[in-house]
């Protein structure tokens, strides 16, 4: 499965939109910084078959989409930017879903993927727990925005490596 060129453009657009969504200085929120345990090893791309990598990317985008689709998120960000960001993520999910079906087959999800997917879910659970504990404060959302920018950058790099393998 070849991810369309528009997919990588969408990736870059999503990162630009997320950067634009920043409302307060990251420096004013340094005291709120937090380690969410991003599973970098799941995104280095070396030990992966393509189907595995696509499934992990899909989970990453899906969880990001879920995180920014909540009521609390709607209250935190400028609505038009949030909508554009969500639309980019939704398009990426469609591209990746088409690839998952092509690479893996409609019926089976390889069990070898599951541990990697669970690592991504665990990471997002820690993000949602942090937001809850911080009562969805502006600084908490800023910390999370910066964190998601970092994790989406890893996703973008993994996608680049996948294209080079093709």
């Amino acid at each position: 499965c070849d991810l369309p060129q528009t997919h990588s453009l969408g990736n870059r657009r999503a990162l630009i939109l997320l950067a634009q969504m920043g409302r307060i200085s990251h420096f004013s929120c340094l005291k709120d910084r937090h380690d969410f345990g991003f599973p970098e090893e799941e995104f280095d791309g070396h030990q992966f078959q393509k189907a595995q990598a696509i499934s992990v990317l899909h989970e990453m985008i899906q969880q990001t989409f879920n995180l920014f689709s909540t009521e609390d998120s709607s209250a935190a960000w400028e609505q038009s930017l949030l909508e554009k960001f969500s639309t980019e993520l939704y398009q990426q999910l469609n591209d990746l879903e088409a690839c998952v079906i092509q690479e893996v087959g409609v019926e089976e999800t390889p069990l070898m993927n599951e541990d990697s997917i669970l690592a991504v879910r665990k990471y997002f659970q820690r993000i949602t727990l942090y937001l809850t504990e911080k009562k969805y404060s502006p600084c908490a959302w800023e910390v999370v925005r910066a964190e998601i920018m970092r994790s989406l950058s890893f996703s973008t790099n993994l996608q680049k490596r996948l294209r080079r393998k093709d």
């Epitope: 380690d35 345990g37 599973p39 989970e59 899906q62 969880q63 879920n66 541990d115 990697s116 669970l118 690592a119 879910r121 665990k122 997002f124 659970q125 820690r126 949602t128």
Partner: antibody, heavy 122, light 107 residues
Framework: EVQLVQAGAEVKAPGESLRISCKVS????????ISWVRQIPGKGLEWMVK????????IYNPSFQGHVSISVDKSITTVYLQWSSLQASDTAIYYC???????????????WGQGTLVAVSS | DIQMTQSPSSLSASVGDSVTITCRAS??????FHWYRQKPGKAPELLIY???NLQTGVPSRFTGSGSGTECTLTITSLQPDDFATYYC?????????FGQGTKLDVR
């Protein structure tokens, strides 16, 4: 096959320290939370604490915070529960459990160890 | 803490019967309800997760339903293996909490 194998029963005196273990196998250790659950004989289940083996990030039940501590050794895929000073009221069966996480981030306990009986008596 | 209250605390039934156990949460837990069975001298085992999903390998005579503050576990066509203690659990809020248990014994 996913397995959580716990150490055997322990008999201790009040004031003594103790560390019990849970050795896991059959999956990627760092991808799943592990919790400890207490069951006082003849009573119900109480969730104590959970740990992310990837970086030892922990979440405690406030009822147990300060009295027990959880830790992991990634090199031997083992989770520990430790007391520095046991009390008679710690007499119970302790289970280690693996969490599964759904896509909507719902936790549930899909695999349980066989349990370790800890008896504290003078 | 979210309190989980099971009813009844105990019940008697015969092989082949159907039984229903109810669990009430002190506040909404969405569908973060789970059910476990504990046989005497054994560790608990997962039966139902997220209120209504059957765990792999669990017979279809077990069904779960409900969401919000109440959920139910129904067991149809009771088998000898089913006489045990059943616990509900919520994982919506910390600390995670269990119901006090329902002991199902032979009439």
């Amino acid at each position: 096959e996913v397995q959580l194998v716990q150490a055997g029963a322990e008999v201790k005196a009040p004031g003594e320290s103790l560390r019990i273990s849970c050795k896991v196998s059959g999956y990627t250790f760092t991808s799943y939370w592990i919790s400890w659950v207490r069951q006082i004989p003849g009573k119900g289940l109480e969730w104590m604490v959970k740990i992310d083996p990837r970086d030892s990030y922990t979440i405690y039940n406030p009822s147990f915070q300060g009295h027990v501590s959880i830790s992991v050794d990634k090199s031997i895929t083992t989770v520990y529960l430790q007391w520095s000073s046991l009390q008679a009221s710690d007499t119970a069966i302790y289970y280690c459990v693996r969490h599964y996480l759904t896509q909507s981030l719902v936790d549930y306990f899909d695999h349980w160890g066989q349990g370790t009986l800890v008896a504290v008596s003078s | 803490d979210i309190q989980m209250t099971q009813s009844p605390s105990s019940l008697s039934a015969s092989v082949g019967d159907s039984v229903t156990i109810t669990c009430r949460a002190s506040q909404s837990v969405s569908n973060y309800f789970h059910w476990y069975r504990q046989k005497p001298g054994k560790a608990p085992e997962l039966l139902i997760y997220s209120a209504s999903n059957l765990q792999t390998g669990v017979p279809s005579r077990f069904t779960g339903s409900g969401s919000g503050t109440e959920c139910t576990l129904t067991i149809t066509s009771l088998q000898p293996d089913d006489f045990a203690t059943y616990y509900c659990q919520q994982t919506h809020g910390y600390p995670f909490t269990f119901g006090q248990g329902t002991k199902l014994d032979v009439r």
